[in-house]
Interface confidence: low
Amino acid sequence: IPVIEPSVPELVVKPGATVTLRCVGNGSVEWDGPPSPHWTLYSDGSSSILSTNNATFQNTGTYRCTEPGDPLGGSAAIHLYVKDPARPWNVLAQEVVVFEDQDALLPCLLTDPVLEAGVSLVRVRGRPLMRHTNYSFSPWHGFTIHRAKFIQSQDYQCSALMGGRKVMSISIRLKVQKVIPGPPALTLVPAELVRIRGEAAQIVCSASSVDVNFDVFLQHNNTKLAIPQQSDFHNNRYQKVLTLNLDQVDFQHAGNYSCVASNVQGKHSTSMFFRVVESAYLNLSSEQNLIQEVTVGEGLNLKVMVEAYPGLQGFNWTYLGPFSDHQPEPKLANATTKDTYRHTFTLSLPRLKPSEAGRYSFLARNPGGWRALTFELTLRYPPEVSVIWTFINGSGTLLCAASGYPQPNVTWLQCSGHTDRCDEAQVLQVWDDPYPEVLSQEPFHKVTVQSLLTVETLEHNQTYECRAHNSVGSGSWAFIPISAGAHTHPPDEFLFTP
């Protein structure tokens, strides 16, 4: 760390005195202090001498000596007072600019430490400080106004009591600037607008900022609109509002509208689209397939997107059959508004029962008329199987009926021994029936198919099994011939009750 001679923190001299300040360091050293006249500087290697043979009040200030090559950045300082009985203050700057809530240092340095007890800060023309002005004083640095406010932008003077009278410094102008965090905040309403030709419309563009100096304009397809501006001041923010009122809209009013505001920090803009239509419209659509298949017992949400202007006057979900005359419970119907002109309507169908398959229609109405969107809901069922022994055209035949949805596939197995389900080790023969006869296939119902296996002679120590499967599951029925007649056995695990 450099060393200053004389080795005192403060030095008090009279005007006209000779002052010599010497700084010595390990390497080269530099002086830094208030800009003032009459100083001469002499350097030789590791020492530097600052001297004047005619000190004035303007030499009052703190002189700091630093060693640029020192990685620790050490420095030493000495404060010089040049106590001029006519000049109690040395003002280093006549304008100070800070942002709101920063501390503002008014750099009037006292030229005589003895005067510290009688100092005060006033505004020009002897006016007292504003209420709430919180300040402190340092004879080395001057007055600090703490957390300065915009309203404290004033001209100040430092006052010292000398021989019973107040002596003022030259004035210092404080400029407290509002902190402008960025471009003005913007709102443009509505975010989207639709009107029928001839209707009225209103678009409002507003911007706000803590500072009054900002501009706002509304433009239509890159053309700036001339709209009278309304101003306001709320919660310490200035607001400027542009309202575009259109009594009878036409197609030329349609297009993109941008609200643009700018200040010293930059520009903000936000846009909306205005659509002018010839007449009312109502469009229904769904992201889902209108033909739905769901496994019985599971749930389904049917969703319809509605785009409409003017707004809906009525809407409902209707069950169109074929199973019962029940209607969807209102509590299962839900409506959400995505924005002004788009809505989503959802019908929740939890734990679907066989009687709930069929057509579901969403109906909506606005001045443009009625529209409907219909979903077809088919339930999927795992196959149910039954086998009987009969004679067809004199031949012994095993007849397998399988019912489910989608249409089941049928496979016959012949295996050794008596079992309620053939396993691989027991299988003697397998027949696939690629085209079983469809007995019934009505919309929204199960499909029932029939497969025939002609058996000339029933082997008594064997089992004949009919297996049916579809995308939902499988079912089987084992037929065990016994001497007293044929015996059929559906495996327990394939009993099915919806």
């Epitope: 006016r127 007292p128 504003m130 209420r131 309203i151 004033q154 009054v212 101003s231």
Partner: antibody, heavy 119, light 112 residues
Framework: QVQLVQSGAEVKKPGASVKVSCKVS????????MHWVRQAPGKGLEWMGG????????IYAQKFQGRVTMTEDTSTDTAYMELSSLRSEDTAVYYC????????????WGQGTLVTVSS | DIVMTQSPLSLPVTPGEPASISCRSS???????????LDWYLQKPGQSPQFLIY???IRASGVPDRFSGSGSGTDFALTISRVEAEDVGVYYC?????????FGQGTKVEIK
């Protein structure tokens, strides 16, 4: 929201003094600048004086200088207006009204205090 | 002191019709920040004055949009686009540029 509640009506004799109070709620008095305005029966509004935040002091209208004193009790957020050497032409409704420190318009106003000067 | 002059002093109006009050100041009320320091107040019968317009043209919150302020420098106006029965009372302009604050003489608006 600032609210101002003034003291009740007063009847005074000529030469006497009257002191009207104005209680502030919703804000503290130090956050506001308080002004006093009077209105003689059937006449217009007349500004008497008020705290000027830019001057840091209370300014009085020339007409009332030396007769009026406006004070504040910040511990109770109450402002006072005292008018001395009353004469019959001081019969009026006296209103307190506030402005913010950075703004100059008066909002809100107190409900008014009728001071009648009569011998 | 700045002298404020209002006209007319009395204004009979018909509900639904527009009405306009003029206010002139003896010197410009335009501040260096670009705003005109002129306010408008309405005193309804038997009530305290209420704040309507500030900085020449800005409506106070809660003031209906049928009230509008205009003007700059020394000439100002308060316009009611469609007078309603509740708008009757005395309207005052006030300059807030400097102390002492000064009011216009007031304009009495009454239904014809």
């Amino acid at each position: 929201q600032v609210q101002l509640v003034q003291s009740g009506a007063e009847v005074k004799k000529p030469g006497a003094s009257v002191k009207v109070s104005c209680k502030v709620s919703g804000y503290t008095l130090t956050e506001l600048s308080m002004h006093w305005v009077r209105q003689a029966p059937g006449k217009g509004l007349e500004w008497m004086g008020g705290f000027d935040p830019e001057d840091g002091e209370t300014i009085y209208a020339q007409k009332f200088q030396g007769r009026v004193t406006m004070t504040e009790d910040t511990s109770t957020d109450t402002a006072y207006m005292e008018l001395s050497s009353l004469r019959s032409e001081d019969t009026a409704v006296y209103y307190c009204a506030t402005a913010g420190l950075e703004i100059r318009w008066f909002d809100p106003w107190g409900q008014g205090t009728l001071v009648t000067v009569s011998s | 002191d700045i002298v404020m002059t209002q006209s007319p002093l009395s204004l009979p109006v018909t509900p639904g019709e527009p009405a306009s009050i003029s206010c002139r100041s003896s010197q410009s009320l335009l501040h260096s920040n670009g705003y005109n320091y002129l306010d408008w107040y309405l005193q309804k019968p038997g009530q305290s004055p209420q704040f309507l317009i500030y900085l020449g043209s800005i409506r106070a919150s809660g003031v209906p949009d049928r009230f509008s302020g205009s003007g700059s420098g020394t000439d100002f106006a308060l316009t009611i686009s469609r007078v309603e029965a509740e708008d009757v009372g005395v309207y005052y302009c006030m300059q807030a540029l400097q102390t002492p604050r000064t009011f216009g003489q007031g304009t009495k608006v009454e239904i014809k």
